[in-house]
């Protein structure tokens, strides 16, 4: 393995040897592999407990996956001079449980950030905005990947996890330029109502594999650029008129609704009517009733109003125990 200081183009990645000398601008940190040609540094599965201080200035793509970082403090990537080229930062699976305010400050070109598969017990409201001002400087982030960041139940704070994530997404209106947001596999029971209003540039939103039961209080109206909305593998029972009208009004959207336990009773009539005429839903003929038992496995598109009844609610005097 070549030492970090010998920048040879013959080997695409140079693994660093520990050095007592002060870091050189283009030195490769210990336990990392560097390619100046690819502008890439990989410090992967090395059980690192902190972000290397001596990252080369040329780094554009930084992989810090599979480590044991635990805490990402304010200014975790702040350097003098700054890492002005860093555009893609992958911190997935690095056992992070705390991301503090300003953790990604001084990264003027950071377009893609992946924090997936970290059990985030604490995500500062200012993790992405960098300041507690009501309107922050816009973040350069375009893609934010936050799949499976829910901590185990015993590590959760008192406040709702949904609320904690939402606060970080809306703080300072910093993420107005965000195009892609992935929030899959986070056990979300609901989506806080103001989040999407603060993310008007979204083109791709992944909320799959959560526990969303209803979208009644969620507004998609201002997401006029939205192209893909992933709602597969949730606990949705029905989509109501307001939601249907909003989705139909989005000019470019494709909606994915597979694997939701649709309840095919009288409340489903509007959704069935909409499904029959919309081009918005992908694979719509796969949507099948889960409840009630007599409707189980029926294709939603093949239902008609006569099929969709609700058991009458008996007045208390007629109910039996």
């Amino acid at each position: 393995t070549s030492s970090a200081s010998s920048s040879s183009s013959s080997a695409p990645f140079l693994a660093s040897a520990a050095s007592a000398q002060p870091p050189l601008p283009d030195q490769c940190p210990a336990l990392c592999e560097c390619s100046e040609a690819a502008r890439t540094v990989k410090c992967v599965n090395r059980n690192l407990t902190e972000v290397p201080t001596d990252l080369p200035l040329y780094v554009r793509n930084l992989f810090l996956t599979g480590n044991q970082l635990a805490v990402l403090p304010a200014g975790a990537f702040a350097r003098r001079p700054p890492l002005a080229e860093l555009a893609a930062l992958n911190l997935s699976g690095s056992r992070l449980d705390e991301v503090r305010g300003g953790a990604f400050e001084h990264l003027p070109s950071l377009r893609q950030l992946d924090l997936s598969h970290n059990p985030l017990a604490y995500l500062s409201p200012f993790a992405f905005s960098g300041s507690n001002a009501s309107i922050s400087a816009p973040s350069p982030l375009v893609e934010l990947i936050l799949n499976h960041i829910v901590p185990p139940d015993d590590k959760r704070q008192n406040r709702s996890f949904e609320g904690m994530v939402a606060a970080a997404l809306v703080a300072g209106r910093a993420l107005q330029g965000l195009h892609l947001l992935e929030l899959a596999s986070n056990h979300f029971l609901y989506l806080p109502r103001d989040v999407l209003a603060q993310l008007p540039s979204l083109r791709y939103l992944d909320l799959s594999n959560n526990s969303l039961v209803s979208l009644t209080y969620v507004s998609f109206r201002n997401l006029t650029h939205l192209e893909s909305l992933h709602l597969e593998d949730n606990a949705l029972k029905v989509l109501h008129n307001g939601t249907l009208a909003e989705l139909q009004g989005l000019p470019h959207v494709r909606v994915f609704l597979d694997n939701n336990p649709w309840v095919c009773d009288c409340h489903m009539a509007d959704m069935v009517t909409w499904l029959k005429q919309t081009g918005v839903v992908q694979g719509k003929d796969r949507l099948t009733c889960a409840f009630p038992e007599k409707m189980r496995n029926r294709v939603l598109l093949e239902l008609n109003s006569a099929d969709l009844d609700c058991d009458p609610i008996l007045p208390p005097s007629l109910q039996t125990s």
């Epitope: 694997n259 099948t288 496995n297 294709v299 598109l301 093949e302 239902l303």
Partner: antibody, heavy 116, light 107 residues
């Protein structure tokens, strides 16, 4: 009551094709997907593919994409699976099953024997 | 694609004995369904959505579990319960996958 009727046996020669049938009754044929499942002797169940009788849309297990072709005849409420380029590996039992989340009704199965 | 692993592959129980078999998923699934297949017959849906008994299934059967670990239990084995039991993941989109089966014999 819901019934899925399959012929008990089919005997065909190697290299030939066969079209297995599954006649549905007791429910609205177009309201449920129809699935096909393979079971080799003393082995487990393997999903082959499914078809929406209403519009003919199909999905296939990658392993069977070049082996099986699913079709339906709505007028007779019958689902078909054609198996091509048959070999001894294809000799086994094939079931049709009505399904969505699960497979709530199954045919009795057709035992296919490929032999010269 | 989720892989389902059933254990044990083969087991035997005496009449009246309690029986438990398991189905382990390679990644988290919401529910599991169970099918019973007696020798020489087609499979029958036996338990669905992890714990609901199909109409006609004796109440000595029960299902439980969540995430990646599920089980089927017979509180008191009877001769007619001798069969192979398959688990299947809860999904309405392809592919549908089954476990390898647990063959339950009567002693």
């Amino acid at each position: 009551q819901v019934q899925l009727q399959q012929p008990g046996t089919e005997l065909v020669k190697p290299g030939a094709s066969v079209k297995l049938s599954c006649k549905a009754s007791g429910y609205t044929f177009t309201s449920y997907w129809m699935h096909w499942v393979k079971q080799r002797p003393e082995q487990g169940l393997e999903w082959i593919g499914n078809i929406n009788p209403s519009n003919g849309n199909t999905n296939y297990n990658e392993r069977f994409k070049s082996k099986a072709t699913l079709t339906v005849d709505k007028s007779s409420s019958t689902a078909y699976m054609q198996l091509s380029s048959l070999t001894s590996e294809d000799s086994t039992v094939y079931y049709c099953a009505r399904g969505g989340w699960d497979f709530d009704y199954w045919g009795q199965g057709t035992t296919l024997t490929v032999s010269s | 694609q989720v892989v389902l692993t059933q254990s044990p592959a083969i087991m035997s129980a005496s009449p009246g004995e309690k029986v438990t078999m398991t189905c382990s998923a390679s990644s988290s699934v919401r529910y599991i369904h169970w099918y019973q297949q007696r020798s020489g017959t087609s499979p029958k849906r036996w338990i669905y959505d992890t714990s609901k008994l199909t109409s006609g299934v004796p109440v000595r059967f029960s299902g439980s579990g969540s995430g990646t670990s599920f089980s089927l239990t017979i509180s008191s084995m009877e001769a007619e319960d001798a069969a192979t039991y398959y688990c299947q993941q809860w999904t309405s989109k392809p592919p549908w996958t089954f476990g390898g089966g647990t063959k339950l014999e009567i002693k």
